[in-house]
Interface confidence: low
């Protein structure tokens, strides 16, 4: 009985952007301005976010779709869907409560944002330093004297990737 | 599927080393950060260092520089943890943590390797 | 060596909800966002909970919450549940020269 009556269920008609309106015999009312369905069949329409203060309106609100926010200039995004702002710090600093700070020696960033993370230690695979770090940069690992030969690669691979959530690949 | 698989249990005697094993699969091992964590028997976590897997820098916690060494081996996308000159407070269980944010902290760990030292 | 202070213990019963804290200094829990949480069962490697002081991993449950004021962090549980028993674990980047430091560890009792 309750299969049967689902089946038959008005509201399932409603498409995205309206509401079934219980209050006028199911029928599929238009969602009111600031809302939005973004599914059909449902009996209420969400309230759209509002970009306020520091975030910013990356796209408006419709009536199938809630609004999208990014930040203003200065800050970057965190979290899903942009959930929070956070300060940039230049290059060569990280984030701390009292603001940002530069990278201790032997340490870098090279994002606005994240930590300072550890030098490349060029010993650990028998190569020497080909260019020095910074508070901005990575060192540069050149080839062991061994290996000082013609076309020899002085490149190290990429750094790792700090962003939250890096798809694996 | 991210998995980090660990090495064996180990029974060391005092004074001996130990190279604990974590073999990653399903990322991009070159593109985290790896940490090790380990755990005594009813205590608490304890962070012993991190290695960047694709420059191989490390960075160890001061209790354990001096002893512990992190190397990785990018064929194989495996991290290796070594701990020499053990006593009876090394035992513990030894885990890898992949670290895949701008904080620092652990998302996906391995099953723990256990490391007794006894005489 | 530990540095972040956890209360031993916790319990509530089925339903209830149940906060932990994790008490630092400015120079770890109070001085950056970075704080986690992690969930151990007993003979299981731990869980990530809640990253950045309040996020949440895709399927960790939106019963855990987690938030922070000054130097110390908190956990909270609300519609508690008898998987959620288990040893919790707060963890913080730290500018000190050890860079993760790990709390004590609370043992949480679902009555």
């Known amino acids: 009985f309750e299969r049967t009556r689902s089946l038959q269920d008005p509201c399932s008609n409603c498409p995205a952007g309206t509401f079934c309106d219980n209050n006028r015999n199911q029928i599929c009312s238009p969602c009111p301005p600031n809302s939005f369905s973004s599914a059909g069949g449902q009996r209420t329409c969400d309230i759209c976010r509002q970009c306020k203060g520091v975030f910013r309106t990356r796209k408006e609100c419709s009536s199938t779709s809630n609004a999208e926010c990014d930040c203003t200039p200065g800050f970057h995004c965190l979290g899903a869907g942009c959930s929070m702002c956070e300060q940039d710090c230049k290059q060569g600093q990280e984030l701390t409560k009292k603001g940002c700070k530069d990278c201790c020696f032997g340490t870098f960033n090279d994002q606005k944002r994240g930590i300072c993370r550890p030098w490349t230690n060029c010993s650990l695979d028998g190569k020497s330093v080909l260019v020095n770090g910074t508070k901005e940069r990575d060192v540069v690992c050149g080839p062991s004297p061994a290996d000082l030969s013609p076309g020899a690669s002085s490149v190290t691979p990429p750094a790792p990737a700090r962003e939250p959530g890096h798809s694996p690949q | 599927e991210v998995q980090l698989l660990e090495s064996g249990a180990e029974v060391k005697k005092p004074g001996a080393s130990v190279k604990v094993s974590c073999k990653a699969s399903g990322y991009t091992f070159t593109s985290y950060y790896m940490h090790w964590v380990r755990q005594a028997p009813g205590q608490g976590l304890e962070w012993m260092g991190i290695i960047n897997p694709s420059g191989g820098s490390t960075s160890y916690a001061q209790k354990f520089q001096g002893r512990v060494t992190m190397t990785r081996d990018t064929s194989t996308s495996t991290v290796y943890m070594e701990l020499s000159s053990l006593r009876s407070e090394d035992t513990a269980v030894y885990y890898c943590?992949?670290?895949?944010?701008?904080?620092?902290?652990?998302?996906?760990w391995g099953q723990g390797t256990l490391v007794t030292v006894s005489s | 060596s530990y540095v972040l202070t956890q209360p031993p213990s916790a319990s509530g019963s089925p339903g209830q909800s149940v906060t932990i804290s994790c008490t630092g200094t400015?120079?770890?829990?109070?001085?950056?966002?970075?704080v986690s949480w992690y969930q151990q069962h007993p003979g299981k490697a731990p869980k990530l909970m809640i990253y950045d002081v309040s996020k949440r991993p895709s399927g960790v449950p939106d019963r855990f919450s987690g938030s922070k004021s000054g130097n110390t962090a908190s956990l909270t549980i609300s519609g508690l549940q008898a998987e959620d028993e288990a040893d919790y674990y707060c963890?913080?980047?730290?500018?000190?020269?050890?860079?993760?430091?790990f709390g004590t560890g609370t043992k949480l009792t679902v009555l």
């Open positions: 400015s120079s770890d829990v109070g001085g950056y966002n970075y």
């Open positions: 963890s913080s980047y730290t500018s000190s020269s050890t860079r993760y430091v």
């Open positions: 943590a992949r670290d895949p944010g701008a904080g620092g902290y652990f998302d996906y």
